[in-house]
């Protein structure tokens, strides 16, 4: 058939067969998940830092009043 | 027609029909938006931390001068 | 020609004509830029926070020794 | 052959030949790697900030008890 002789379609098959777009989308979503997790960890650290700072401020302000 | 017999074209249809590239691009842009929002939240936390630190420094330096 | 009758090829044209993969790759790279710039801004804020903390530590340790 | 006359297939070849999806996936993974490295650097900075804060708290609480 004409397809058998077509280098263009052979190229289409060659290039895209291994990674259909579903896989690409899955990769993008996986990357999102990973980065969101990393950012979540940063967020948790920051919450901890805010707490430490609140404690420091509490100590300093209680000293000022005493 | 020749298309009916073509496993290559069937594969093209099979792989790409469900997720056209517009959807992939939309996914990428959506991921960007989400991650930017997360980073913005971190930024807001950091601004708060900077304020707390400025207050601590203010207390400490005012003590030094008194 | 056979192509004119092919719903599969019509679909290929429909799905992929507007967003060639170059555009998709460019979109991914653009997203990287934006996120890197946002992270750079966070980094600058953190550097400032580290400096403020170093100054606080300096004040506290100089007090201890006096 | 029919392919030679097909603007649709010419478009497929024109748009997609240079960037097979493997390349797109590689780009996504490369971007992930870079952003993860940047976030790792932020994480390291935060760990340092937490240590500085712990030291400040230690100094302040040791003063309170003395």
């Amino acid at each position: 058939s004409p397809q058998d002789r077509s280098p263009i379609l052979a190229e289409v098959k060659h290039s895209f067969y291994p990674i259909p777009e579903q896989t690409l989308q899955a990769t993008v979503l996986e990357v999102r998940h990973e980065l969101k997790e990393d950012i979540k960890a940063l967020n948790a650290k920051m919450t901890n830092i805010e707490k430490q700072l609140s404690e420091i401020l509490r100590i300093l302000t209680s000293r000022r009043s005493s | 027609s020749p298309q009916d017999r073509s496993p290559i074209l069937a594969e093209v249809k099979h792989s790409f029909y469900p997720i056209p590239e517009q959807t992939l691009q939309a996914t990428v842009l959506e991921v960007r938006h989400e991650l930017k929002e997360d980073i913005k939240a971190l930024n807001a936390k950091m601004t708060n931390i900077e304020k707390q630190l400025s207050e601590i420094l203010r207390i400490l330096t005012s003590r030094r001068s008194s | 020609s056979p192509q004119d009758r092919s719903p599969i090829l019509a679909e290929v044209k429909h799905s992929f004509y507007p967003i060639p993969e170059q555009t998709l790759q460019a979109t991914v790279l653009e997203v990287r830029h934006e996120l890197k710039e946002d992270i750079k801004a966070l980094n600058a804020k953190m550097t400032n926070i580290e400096k403020q903390l170093s100054e606080i530590l300096r004040i506290l340790t100089s007090r201890r020794s006096s | 052959s029919p392919q030679d006359r097909s603007p649709i297939l010419a478009e497929v070849k024109h748009s997609f030949y240079p960037i097979p999806e493997q390349t797109l996936q590689a780009t996504v993974l490369e971007v992930r790697h870079e952003l993860k490295e940047d976030i790792k650097a932020l994480n390291a900075k935060m760990t340092n900030i937490e240590k500085q804060l712990s030291e400040i708290l230690r100094i302040l609480t040791s003063r309170r008890s003395s």
Epitope: - | L29, R32, H33, K36 | Q25, A26, L29, E30, H33, E34, E37, D38, K40, A41 | T27, E30, E34
Partner: antibody, heavy 114, light 107 residues
Framework: EVKLVESGGGLVKPGGSLKLSCAAS????????MSWVRQTPEKRLEWVAS???????YFPDNVKGRFTISRENAGNILFLQMSSLRSEDTAMYYC????????WGQGTLVTVSA | DIKMTQSPSSMYASLGERVTITCKAS??????LSWYQQKPWKSPKILIY???SLADGVPSRISGSGSGQDYSLTISSLESDDTATYYC?????????FGGGTKLEIK
């Protein structure tokens, strides 16, 4: 077809101000970061400013504090507000799509001279 | 800032000849490099992005290669239409910086 059309260039005295505009069409403007690039009379190309799709702005040090970049997504327009202009700001100013500068407009000439 | 050193600054080549222009970055730019062609009185046009990816509508006789700090643009068989100035741009780290340009003329 992607089209970027700049306007607002002209002759201005040192210390003066000028606002450039860029009308974009042929793509979803709100999805893209946009940039300004300039070409000096010596044909040297310089990145001037970028703005992300959601409005975050970026500048090189030599224009920071003097130039502001903004966008109007509803009207598909990009702006560059330039103030405290110097003779070294004399250049052809191009509006471009993305951080990667994938498409350029035809440019608008800015001349800073007494 | 990352400095981009482009060479040669100008060159002459014959029709059909293979031409290579190089750009060296002062540090690793991880393939975040684009190549542009500018004809007299026209705005630049993108040829290559991400070091090796051919932009839409660019003939396949033009190619980009390189990684790390060293990159090159190659025209496999020079045509009269290739008379222009070529620039590289690194967009790996802001501030984004351009090479000084290479003026290519036909012998």
């Amino acid at each position: 077809e992607v089209k970027l059309v700049e306007s607002g260039g002209g002759l201005v005295k040192p210390g003066g101000s000028l606002k450039l505009s860029c009308a974009a069409s042929g793509f979803t403007f709100s999805n893209y970061a946009m940039s300004w690039v300039r070409q000096t009379p010596e044909k040297r190309l310089e990145w001037v400013a970028s703005i992300s799709s959601d409005g975050d702005t970026y500048f090189p040090d030599n224009v920071k504090g003097r130039f502001t970049i903004s966008r109007e997504n509803a009207g598909n327009i990009l702006f560059l507000q330039m103030s405290s202009l110097r003779s070294e700001d004399t250049a052809m100013y191009y509006c471009a799509r993305g951080f990667m500068i994938t498409f350029w407009g035809q440019g608008t000439l800015v001349t800073v001279s007494a | 800032d990352i400095k981009m050193t482009q060479s040669p600054s100008s060159m002459y080549a014959s029709l059909g000849e293979r031409v290579t222009i190089t750009c060296k970055a002062s540090q690793d730019i991880k393939s975040y490099l684009s190549w542009y062609q500018q004809k007299p009185w026209k705005s630049p046009k993108i040829l290559i992005y991400y070091a090796t990816s051919l932009a839409d509508g660019v003939p396949s006789r033009i190619s980009g290669s390189g990684s790390g700090q060293d990159y090159s643009l190659t025209i496999s068989s020079l045509e009269s239409d290739d008379t222009a100035t070529y620039y590289c741009l690194q967009h790996g780290e802001s501030p984004y910086t351009f090479g000084g340009g290479t003026k290519l003329e036909i012998k």
